[in-house]
Structure formats: C-alpha cells, structure tokens
Interface confidence: low
C-alpha cells in the first residue's frame, strides 16, 4: 500500500539503486516515486554532514522485502517511494529554495526583477529543468537579478551549493503551466534524427510518448513498429533531444512512428503509467513472480499491487492453466520496460498501475505548494482542492468555498446551506482560479446530496460541517485534486504553516474577489482563542487562526473554505472556514471547525454502498 | 472549427497546368501532415501525395510522380499541388486532407473538394 | 503499392439490418487500417481508425474488426439505419504511399 511517513534521523542502509543532488527529501521523494526500481529513499541535508560532496545527497534504494534496516543519522530525512500512493504521485514541484545554488548546465541568462519571473521563464522554455537566481542583494553587483536557466543529463542538479543572496527552483513544466503548448500529433512513417538519450523497448507509440514525457531530457521520440524491417529493432523506443527542442530532420520511413514530448501541454499532463493491455504480446523480463489468478484484469491488479511489479503477462497456454485460472507472470526490469516483447502468443501483457494518479479513493493529496482580507493572488494549480459553491436563482453568484475530498465527495460548512437546503440551485466549480473565467460553457458539478451534520443548529457555531456528494465523480489533475485529511482526533501535531484560500470580501463591507486569494496565518490555541470571544463557546472542535494585530482572515465568501497546514510536505485539511467577528480585527481569530474532530463522522457518511470506505486520511 | 478550403480548380487542356490551394483554419496547421486525395466522376478514392509538418519529405502516388508538387507555406497556413503535364485522366475533384493527431489514425479532417477537368 | 480489396462492390439491405463489409490487404498491414463513409456530393468521412477505434461523434453501431494476419478487416453496421446508405471505403496507412479500397455501395432494398 501507500507510505507517506518520513524517518527523521534516520538512513537506510544498502539496496542503492541511484543518488543524485536534490534540494530537499520531498523533491528526492518524487525522483524515487518516479524511479522504476527505487522503493525507498534517504536524503542528507546540508546540515547533517561534513562531506561537501554528500550535501543534499539523495539516495534511492531497492530492497526485494520492501524494507531495509535504518541507521541513525542525525539531520537525514528517509522515506518511501509513493508509487500505488494514487492522487498523490505527481512530478509537479513549486519550492523555490533560498539560499541554494543548484547547479547544471547554464544556458541561457537573462535579468529579471523576481525568482518568480526566473521560474516562469524557465517553464517556458522547452530545454530548461531547473534555475538559479540572484537577487537584489547578491555580493556581486553586476550579478544581480540574473536568470540563469539550467538543465543537466539526468535532470537534477550536478551539485548543490549554499550561497547566499541565490535562490533556485525547478521548471514548473510537470505542473502543466507550461506557455509552450505542445504537439499532440504523431507522424506515420516518419523517423526523428538528432541525439538520442534514451532507449526501451514499448508495445506502441503511445506508451514510447509517455515515457518521453516524464524523462527529463527527451523531447521527442522515434518509435520503431512490430513489423519493421530490422528485426532487432522491433518495438525500440528511441527518446531523443537536440539544441533547438525540435528535431533538425525528419525522414520518411515505413514502420516507423515519431512524436513529441507532452510536457509542455497546458492545463493537463497523460499519467505517468499505462493502463492498456496489449493480447497476444508477451513481455519479457526478470521473474518476480508467478501467481494462478482468473483473468487478464485481475493479473494486473496483482502487478499493481506487488509494489515491485513493473509489468506482467498472462498466460493462456493449456500447460499454465488449471480450472479458470492462469499463470499470471509478473515481471520487473532495470529501466521499468519489458526487455523482450513477443507477438502472435497465447498470451496478454501490459503494466503495473503503481503510478497511475488516479489511483484509488484515498484522500491523502499531493505536495503542492484566501478574497481573503490580506491575502494575496493565488496560481494556477496551488490549491487544486478548492471549489467554488455558486448559487443559481435568477442571477448566478459565488456564496461559499469548499474543499475537494475525494472524487465524488467536497467538504465545506453547513452555514452555506443555510435557507438553501434545495440542491437543485447549487452549481460546483472546480478546477479554476479565475471566478471571471466562469462562462455559461464553463462545465461544474451538480449535488446528488447535501450531508449537514445531525447537531449543527442555524445560527449556532457548533458542528458548522456538512458534505456534498456530487451527481458525477470528477477526474484528478494538476489543477482538480483532493486535500488530505488529517488522522482522527489530531491533536499532537504542531503545525507551523497554515493557509486559508478563498474568494471572499477582501475587507468587511467589500466584495466577492476574482482572482483565489491565499493568506497564511498561525494557529492559535483554543485557550487564547477563547479570551477573545468571551461571548461564544470555543469548543474543542473547534480551530482558532489570525494575528493578535490583525489584517489577515477569512471573509464573507470564504466561509466552507479550506484552512490547510503543510507538514512533512504534505497538505492537510485542518479547518473549515466558518465564522468570526468582523474580518481580520485586532485580537478576533477566524473561528474554523476542527476537521481531525469530525473524521467518524466524515468516514461514515462517504461509505460507500459496498461499505467500503471512499477516502482514508494518511497513513 | 476545422475548416479546409480547396480552390483553383477549373477547365484545363491536356499538357496544361493548374495550381490547388487549401486553406487551413481553425488548428495549428505547421503541426499537421497533409495529403491530396482524388475521385474521377462517379470512381473511388485515390490517393495522390503527402507532405509532412515541416515542408520536408514528401511522396507520391506513381500515376502523378514527376507531374505534381506538393508544397506548404506554414506561415498562409496553406497547402498547395502544382499539377502540370495534365492528361484526361486527371479529371477528378480533388480534397485536401489532414492527417489525424493519433497513431494510426486516418485523415480526420477534409475539404469540400475542387474538381479538376482536363479536357480539350 | 498495397492492394486493397473490398467486398462486395454493392449491396442492398433494409434498415434495421446488419451489414458486414470485408476489406483485403495484398500484405499485412498490422492494424494501419482506417473506414470512411461517403455520400454523393460530400467529402468522405473518417468511421474507423486503427481497425477498430471509433472515430469521435460515429455511432457506435459501426464496429470496426480485424485478423491477426493483418491482411482481414471488417466493417460490420449493427443496425442499418436511413442515414447509412451511402458508399464505404476502406483505407491502409501502413505504407506512406496510402492506397484505397475501390469502395462498397450500401443502398435500400
């Protein structure tokens, strides 16, 4: 299953597969996630070694038992890959780090006025992985604002290095905020010239693209079919880059197939896995497994399950098969693709969906990075969990935020029902950032369900929590996923970086704001939280937020909204925005409902009809 | 919307020439490999040439090689068949159409045809 | 070039009925197989790509099949309806040089 639990001071020892330079144990986490063999990780920070050539060690590592013992290591940070994690795999990673020179291949500098403007330039520019910049206050004048665009052989940076006044970040390309726009088409009978980077053997052009598109140097490929000429380069997958980003030359020839890296495609990504299955293919590699199972479709949950498992073939020569079920051969090799693809057999093939992200009903959601009264503009895909519950009648209006909490499922405060119980009125925008790009065309969820909690009473603060169950189930992607929910009862973490997002008045008599606003505001506890509201109850299940000064909170319109804390890069949906007097005064935190108090509540209501759960918080 | 638009077609002599345009809307046209495709009066379809997204490789059915030209100008979002040393049996309407966005995909896309009559 | 052969050249049939076309390859062409329909006066449309992928906004009752040869295919129409009746063509793309089938004409009975 999934393992999202980080070691702290911990290394595990052996079972190494690759290392490389990464800035944190997050970003080592997505390099391992994406690995084809790599289970579990260790990442040395700055700070917890000597060893210059070590710092921001990353080291991804493979164990057959799925387990390795860990060392004591002060400073290290180890986890586990996040394949069969669903909605939480993602190659989508915003940090900027401050600070850090991440070094690689520079190629292009330009002056710009922000790290901002740096990362955005190096999304759009098809060759760039990573950048560093020096700000205003770099040492050396004639440095500073300079843009250093950079990209090295494996995609991570040949050497991090402390620097003061550099900050350095990745291209936001996986997150699909590439400007490029990309080719979607591939060519018949047509074959790529220039440098090749990469060669696997796939069944079809389609899987050649995909593996082209999360290798962090291919930007097009030349795929060879089953009935080229050359019988030793059947099925070769040939991953490709050149100078310019295109290919210099094409040349027409039969049995051969080419296209283009989707990375650069705007507003959606193809998931890193592949979900067909090819019959009459078998795929060879080494043996991991042999399992008697009945069918094709229940071989590859097998696969997908043995989180070692990269793909398989089912057999259905008489020899291996006894009753209704089949020898179901379940393989793995160094670069994740068959080392052998055979046609015209008894047999079906394809891929493990370890990395398939949209996975099962799982909460837990990814590491991605309120109006709001001193907020600021959120981007695209920062909080992909956030919805916008707009009320139809004869004019159409945005009332309440909400939180995406599994495909079918958003969580928000039963106050936004209040006098508008009927869910026929209720319109469900997910997915935006803009409320002004909202169309007559613009497609949104409708309500199957409004679940308000059995104690909550109109006008009281209490149980202010209610669940929308959608008519349809959404799609996940970069820009519409859920937020993790927090374990039951939560109340020993400390969390340190809190956000509420919305678009609700950005002062007390203002009005709804276009632009999803984000603020950060601290946690207060309930004790100070009460010496504040005198008047009114703080319970327990409840959460307090805001600065004794005031100046930044949630508002009219945020109300259902998400206040989320990062911990362990990961997102959490602490509180639900709920009520508060005034917006953003002197010692008056936002009140939120305390979600970790609710999750039996929650956990009930979302069974399923089967009764199986339709969202776990993490492990 | 996909729109191709064939014009220049027209009454021609034997040996003579004429030039076929389409004009491409409403896709990304330096993207796309298109093709020239023909039917004589009341026959079936022929394919005539292609020519891929970049203006480079082209090829030819043997009943036009050496007589026809297939070109693009990607900048007009145009393409083009310089057909000369026509014969009776060029007589056709001739479409234009776009290769589709997929492996093995046929073409997705056509126009509305322009017919070509050679004919003294 | 590619030969491709299709049977029958014409055929009569009444709405509602099924209709199966045969399509013949002079060599394997794997799955580089694609149907279009065609009515008088009008540019053909694309049915079928890859043997059996339906073309976005086709019917569903047009189903596209194939044998493991290569050299096969079938177009078969589960239910004949009035908008059907028309001339269908079959097409390989696994050579550059794409050829056609001479085109079969379904017509009312």
């Known amino acids: 299953g999934c393992l999202t639990q980080l070691y702290e001071n911990a290394f595990f020892r052996g079972g190494d597969v690759a290392s490389m330079y990464t800035p944190n144990a997050q970003y080592c986490q997505m390099r391992c996630t994406f690995h084809p063999r790599c289970l579990l990780f260790s990442f040395l920070p700055a700070s917890s070694i000597n060893d210059m050539e070590k710092r921001f060690g990353c080291f991804l590592k493979d164990s057959v038992t799925g387990t390795l013992p860990k060392v004591h290591r002060t400073g290290a940070v180890s986890g586990h890959s996040l394949k069969q994690c669903g909605h939480q795999i993602s190659a989508c990673h915003r940090d900027i780090y401050k600070g850090v020179d991440m070094r690689g291949v520079n190629f292009n500098v330009s002056k710009v006025s922000s790290v901002e403007e740096c990362q955005k330039r190096c999304t759009s520019n098809i060759r760039c992985q990573f950048f560093s910049y020096a700000t205003q206050t770099f040492h050396k004048a004639e440095y500073r604002n300079n843009c250093l665009l950079k990209y090295s052989p494996g995609g991570t940076p040949t050497a991090i290095k402390v620097l003061s006044n550099v900050e350095s970040g990745f291209s936001l390309k996986p997150c699909a905020l590439s400007e490029i726009g990309c080719h979607m088409n591939i060519f018949q009978h047509l074959a790529f010239s220039d440098v090749d980077v990469a060669r696997v053997l796939t069944p079809d052009a389609f899987v050649c693209r995909t593996i082209c598109t999360y290798h962090p140097n291919c930007l097009f490929f030349t795929f060879y079919t089953n009935v080229w000429k050359i019988e030793s380069q059947r099925n070769v997958c040939l991953l490709k880059t050149s100078e310019s980003g295109t290919p210099s030359s094409s040349t027409p020839q039969e049995n051969t197939i080419s296209g283009y890296s989707l990375l650069t495609c705007k507003r959606t990504l193809p998931e890193p896995c592949h979900s067909k299955i090819y019959p009459g293919v078998d795929f060879g590699g080494e043996e991991l497994n042999v399992t008697f199972v009945k069918g094709v479709n229940v071989c590859q949950e097998t696969c997908t399950k043995m989180i070692r498992c990269q793909f398989f073939t089912y057999s259905l020569l008489p020899e291996d098969c006894k009753e209704e079920k089949c020898k179901c051969f379940l393989r793995l090799s160094m670069d994740g693709s068959p080392t052998r693809i055979a046609y015209g057999t008894q047999g079906s093939s394809g891929y493990s969906l370890r990395l398939c992200n949209t996975g099962d009903n799982s909460v837990c959601t990814t590491k991605t990075s309120t109006r709001i009264v001193g907020g600021t503009n959120s981007s695209w895909g920062e909080w992909p969990w956030q919805v916008s519950l707009q009320v139809k009648l004869t004019a159409q209006r945005h009332l309440c935020g909400g939180s995406l909490i599994g495909h079918q499922w958003v969580l928000t405060a039963a106050h936004c029902f209040d006098g508008l119980p009927l869910q026929d009125v209720w319109r469900i925008y997910s997915g935006i950032l803009n409320l002004s790009d909202i169309t007559k065309d613009t497609p949104f969820s409708q309500i199957k369900e409004i679940i308000i909690h059995q104690n909550y009473k109109v006008s009281e603060g209490n149980h202010d929590i209610a669940l929308i169950k959608l008519q349809a189930p959404l799609n996940y992607t970069e820009f519409q996923k859920p937020i993790c929910l927090p374990s039951k009862g939560d109340t020993s973490t400390i969390y340190t970086n809190c956000w509420v997002t919305g678009w609700g008045f950005s002062k007390e008599k203002g009005e709804i704001q276009n632009i999803l606003q984000k603020v950060n505001i601290p946690l207060v506890t309930n004790e100070e939280c009460q010496k504040r509201y005198q008047d009114y109850k703080i319970t327990q299940r409840m959460v307090c937020a805001g600065y004794k000064e005031g100046g930044k909170d949630a508002c009219k319109g945020d109300s259902g909204g998400p206040l989320v804390c990062k911990h362990n890069g990961m997102w959490r949906l602490v509180g639900i925005t709920s009520w508060g007097e005034g917006c953003a005064r002197r010692e008056q935190p936002g009140v939120y409902t305390k979600v970790a108090e609710y999750m039996d509540w929650i956990l009930e209501k979302t069974q399923s009809s089967d009764g199986k759960a339709q969202m776990q918080s993490p492990a | 919307e996909v729109q191709l638009l064939e014009s220049g077609g027209g009454l021609v002599q034997p040996g003579g020439s004429l030039r076929l345009s389409c004009a491409a809307s409403g896709f990304t046209f330096s993207w796309y490999t298109m093709h020239w495709v023909r039917q004589a009066p009341g026959k079936g379809l022929e394919w005539v040439s292609v020519?891929?997204?970049?203006?480079?490789?082209?090829s030819y059915a043997d009943s036009v090689k050496g007589r026809f030209t297939i070109s693009r100008d990607n900048s007009k979002n145009t393409l083009y068949l310089q057909m000369n040393s026509l014969r009776a049996e060029d007589t056709a309407t001739y479409y234009c159409?776009?290769?589709?966005?997929?492996?093995?995909?046929?073409?997705?896309?056509w126009g509305q045809g322009t017919l070509v009559t050679v004919s003294s | 070039d590619i030969q491709m052969t299709q049977s029958p050249s014409s055929l009569s049939a009444s709405v509602g009925d099924r209709v199966t076309i045969t399509c013949r390859a002079s060599q394997s062409i794997a799955t580089y197989l694609n149907w279009y329909q065609q009515k008088p006066g009008r540019a053909p449309k694309l049915l079928i790509y890859a043997a059996s992928s339906l073309q976005s906004g086709v019917p569903s009752r047009f189903v596209g099949g194939g044998s493991g040869s290569g050299t096969h295919f079938t177009l078969t129409i589960s239910s004949l309806q009035p908008e059907d009746f028309a001339t269908y063509y079959c097409?390989?793309?696994?050579?550059?040089?794409?050829?056609f089938g001479q085109g079969t004409k379904v017509e009312i009975k």
């Open positions: 097409q390989q793309s696994y050579s550059t040089r794409e050829t």
């Open positions: 159409a776009r290769d589709g966005s997929g492996s093995y995909l046929g073409f997705d896309y």
């Open positions: 020519i891929y997204p970049s203006g480079g490789p082209t």
